[in-house]
């Protein structure tokens, strides 16, 4: 059962796993949620009645019954992990803590103009977990405006003390705000020879990479596959770090794979969700329960629904035994990974999907697209919305993209002459415009946020957000698209599509069925040559065929230029402007979304 509220002056007795330090009970709850075993916690707030050495302690707890006896204690705040909840979870913590010094290994000291600049520095430093900033009122002259970057083994402070005139906070890497490069490649036959900070068992290099990503100290990893010559090291995932943040030595070794933490791209790539099944593989661990199940899929469901289950092994039924049901072994371990992985015993293993909610919804695989043709099929572009105006009569105005459960990203030029959000309607999960009737449900628009530097589409900043009056419940036909990662600026996208109900030629009408066209990206230099009378800035991105023939057109404005990269769709562009439609040597010009990620996050994450 999901319990989100905090219990004041209450302490849970027993069940201690470990103690960490957090600046607030709210953050203690987040730490508990991300810990592989924590189900409940008790946090001690600062209080005159409490020993100062116990202030800010966050005791992580576990219980077979999922609850513990409650005891009254002043200054104690207790609660439950969000593991038991179905809602989306994020580790992003933008709070700034005044007069608190969060202790850790201080490895970098520099002058910063503000706490915000210090936080940005921490976010863009590969080692930084949190920071403390001495304000200009700090007593010690030389320390005023000093920004201390810190890290620890756990990613949380080793201690928190009161210190006047300082502020502390966490890195915003988990808020998708880091400018650090996002290196998704996995290097075969490679061993990174750097210091190991931890090791776990993993069924493949992808799971190893995801574990590295959410391990606070891991910057890169090496995985020994099941064919690795040394038997004791097979399926071993070595989590690594180095002072420079990069591997110092790469050794060529067959049957080993290496890669990097995906910390800087974790909002657009699944890192907690290990959804694959591993055939002829047994995961060993502490046994939680043995249940009969019809299939390995059913076994995974049982594991996902059992809050303490972390992974499972399913042994299929022998012939007609037990009504064709096999045995489903629900398991757990101290770190969420199997203690050993065995092959050749006929089992099918996998992980709980409970942690998938810690990943961005946009990373969920959508159904395979239909190749060829220009008309889309239902559920092919579930982030695409049609934006209607009701004044003077109802009609399709622009396209848009779902980027959050209350947010649509579109083009600013769509709102020329739109006096009020009251006349707007957002329809999601629509394939044909003819589906929209009087009684078709829609989302009202609470607010239109146009970029304050927008003047006209051709001069850039053609971007706007629509805040919806109600939240979107994600389904197969309506779900968000990932924003591109700031660390992905150098990625060359090769699988890009423009979609919309717009005109198919310059003098035409709005199409009934959502149209799609695969379009190659064009470099900004090339695009500039085609538009000599305009300034093509780095905040624009162009796409189109040299010979023309396929392009966005009137009515597609605001819609997505969607590019698939590493199995995840990214909103690379917003349909903005162009000379005519699908003309030879006149590519379409799109708002380059990666350049506006900060702006989008600032507006959508504003308290």
């Amino acid at each position: 059962e999901c319990v989100t509220q905090l219990l004041k002056d209450t302490c849970f007795e027993g069940g201690d796993i470990t103690t960490v330090f957090t600046p607030s009970a709210k953050y203690c709850q987040v730490v508990c949620t991300y810990h592989p075993r924590c189900l409940l916690f008790t946090f001690t707030a600062e209080s005159p009645s409490e020993d100062p050495t116990r202030w800010f302690t966050c005791v992580l707890k576990d219980s077979v019954t999922e609850t513990l006896p409650r005891v009254n204690r002043t200054a104690a705040i207790s609660g439950y992990s969000f593991k038991q909840c179905s809602h989306q979870i994020s580790a992003c913590n933008k709070d700034i803590y005044v007069d608190l010094d969060m202790k850790g290994i201080n490895y970098n000291s520099s002058v910063a103009k503000s706490a915000q600049e210090c936080q940005e520095r921490c976010t863009d430093d590969v080692h930084c977990h949190f920071f403390t900033y001495a304000t200009r009122q700090f007593p010690s002259l030389e320390h005023r405006n000093i920004c201390l970057l810190k890290h620890t083994q756990t990613g949380t402070p080793t201690r928190i003390t009161k210190l006047d005139k300082v502020v502390s906070g966490f890195s915003l890497k988990s808020c998708a705000l880091s400018n650090l490069a996002c290196i998704r490649d996995i290097f075969p036959n490679t061993v990174f020879a750097d210091s190991n900070i931890d090791s776990v068992m993993a069924p493949d290099a992808f799971v190893c990479g995801r574990i590295c990503t959410h391990h606070p100290g891991c910057l890169f990893f090496t995985f020994f596959s099941q064919e690795w010559p040394k038997e004791s090291q097979r399926n071993l995932c070595l989590l690594k770090t180095s002072e420079s943040g990069l591997p110092s030595t790469r050794i060529k070794k067959s049957k080993a794979l290496s890669g990097f933490s995906l910390q800087s791209c974790r909002h657009s790539i699944p890192v907690f969700c290990h959804s694959s099944f591993y055939h002829d593989t047994d995961f060993l661990g502490e046994e939680l329960d043995i249940v009969a199940a019809k299939s390995h899929e059913a076994c995974q469901k049982l594991c996902t629904n059992a809050v303490r289950c972390q992974f499972f092994t399913y042994t299929p039924a022998q012939a007609s035994c037990n009504e064709g049901k096999g045995k489903c072994y629900l398991k757990l371990s101290s770190n969420g990974s199997p203690t050993k992985i065995l092959h050749g015993r006929g089992g099918i293993s996998g992980y709980t999907l409970r942690l998938c909610k810690m990943d961005n919804e946009c990373t969920t695989k959508i159904k395979p697209r239909i190749v060829g043709g220009t008309a889309s099929v239902r559920g092919e572009w579930p982030w695409q919305v049609t934006l209607h105006t009701t004044s003077p009569t109802q009609r399709h105005l622009c396209g848009g993209s779902i980027i959050g459960n209350q947010w649509i990203l579109t083009a600013a030029h769509c709102f020329y002459g739109v006096e009020s959000p009251k006349i707007l309607r957002v329809y999601s999960g629509i394939l044909n415009q003819s589906e929209i009737k009087e009684d078709t449900s829609f989302f009202g628009v609470q607010e239109i946020i146009i970029h304050d530097q927008y003047k006209m589409a051709e001069s850039g900043y053609d971007i706007a957000l629509l805040k919806l009056e109600t939240t979107v419940n994600y389904t197969d036909s309506q779900r968000p698209i990932c924003l591109p990662s700031k660390g992905d600026r150098n990625v060359i996208y090769t699988d890009c599509w423009v979609t919309g109900w717009g005109y198919r030629k310059l003098r035409d009408k709005i199409q009934n069925t959502l149209q799609k066209a695969k379009i190659p990206l064009v470099t900004n230099e090339e695009c500039q040559k085609r538009y000599r009378g305009h300034k093509i800035t780095h905040k624009m991105i162009c796409a189109g065929y040299r010979e023309g023939g396929k392009d966005a057109c009137k009515g597609d404005s605001g819609g997505p230029l969607s590019c698939k990269h590493n199995e995840v769709w990214h909103l690379v562009g917003i349909t903005s402007w162009g000379e005519g439609c699908a003309q030879r040597e006149r590519p379409g010009v799109y708002t380059n979304v990666v350049e506006y990620v900060d702006w989008i996050l600032e507006k959508t994450q504003a308290v």
């Epitope: 970098n108 007593p139 010690s140 030389e142 300082v166």
Partner: antibody
Framework: EVQLVQSGAEVKKPGASVKVSCKAS????????MHWVRQAPGQGLEWMGI????????SYAQKFQGRVTMTRDTSTSTVYMELSSLRSEDTAVYYC?????????????????WGQGTTVTVSS | EIVMTQSPATLSVSPGERATLSCRAS??????LAWYQQKPGQAPRLLIY???TRATGIPARFSGSGSGTEFTLTISSLQSEDFAVYYC?????????FGGGTKVEIK
């Protein structure tokens, strides 16, 4: 042992420049600030400026602004103080002195380690 | 800039006696004050920081007090090696400034 070793005495003509070095040893060079203080013959101490060896940021006393430049070389753990457009009043002993430990926040400190001093004589 | 004024300019004291040196700031420097000792031909040596905290290796006969604008350095029982010039310095605002010094001489 924590030490600051300065370069030898200099004799300069008015209008010339002088560059004094201060080599640090026995501690993590980039973790502490470094000050320069001078003392004219028979006079008191006069603060000239500060450098943060980690990032190289500096702050100078108004009196020396435009004439003084403080730099550092982290590979040799050395700070330098260059004073240009020398005049006879610049004749003094120049000291480097270690300042605050910048990897911890604490309220109070002093210049706890000093170089042996470099005598600069400006004379035509 | 903050002006630091030390008094007296010269203090004549017999060995074993108590010496009290004063330092006044033109504006509050809170407790951001240090005291140094300098002997002829030598570099200054840190005695006290934070107005009252003795630096490492400094004998207990040296003590500092005061905050804001008025500060005192006390040497409880003067030893022969204590005869030197003493400087106060404020660390509260740029530029850092020193007092003119107090010379403690043998009476």
């Amino acid at each position: 042992e924590v030490q600051l070793v300065q370069s030898g005495a200099e004799v300069k003509k008015p209008g010339a420049s002088v560059k004094v070095s201060c080599k640090a040893s026995g501690y993590t060079f980039t973790s502490y600030s470094m000050h320069w203080v001078r003392q004219a013959p028979g006079q008191g101490l006069e603060w000239m400026g500060i450098i943060n060896p980690s990032g190289g940021s500096t702050s100078y006393a108004q009196k020396f602004q435009g004439r003084v430049t403080m730099t550092r070389d982290t590979s040799t753990s050395t700070v330098y103080m260059e004073l240009s457009s020398l005049r006879s009043e610049d004749t003094a002993v120049y000291y480097c002195a270690r300042g605050a430990y910048l990897l911890e926040l604490y309220y109070y400190y002093g210049m706890d380690v000093w170089g042996q001093g470099t005598t600069v004589t400006v004379s035509s | 800039e903050i002006v630091m004024t030390q008094s007296p300019a010269t203090l004549s004291v017999s060995p074993g006696e108590r010496a009290t040196l004063s330092c006044r700031a033109s504006q509050s420097v809170s407790s951001n004050l240090a005291w140094y000792q300098q002997k002829p031909g030598q570099a200054p040596r840190l005695l006290i920081y934070g107005a009252s905290t003795r630096a490492t290796g400094i004998p207990a006969r040296f003590s500092g007090s005061g905050s804001g604008t008025e500060f005192t350095l006390t040497i409880s029982s003067l030893q022969s090696e204590d005869f030197a010039v003493y400087y106060c310095q404020q660390f509260n605002d740029w530029p850092l400034t020193f007092g003119g010094g107090t010379k403690v001489e043998i009476k």
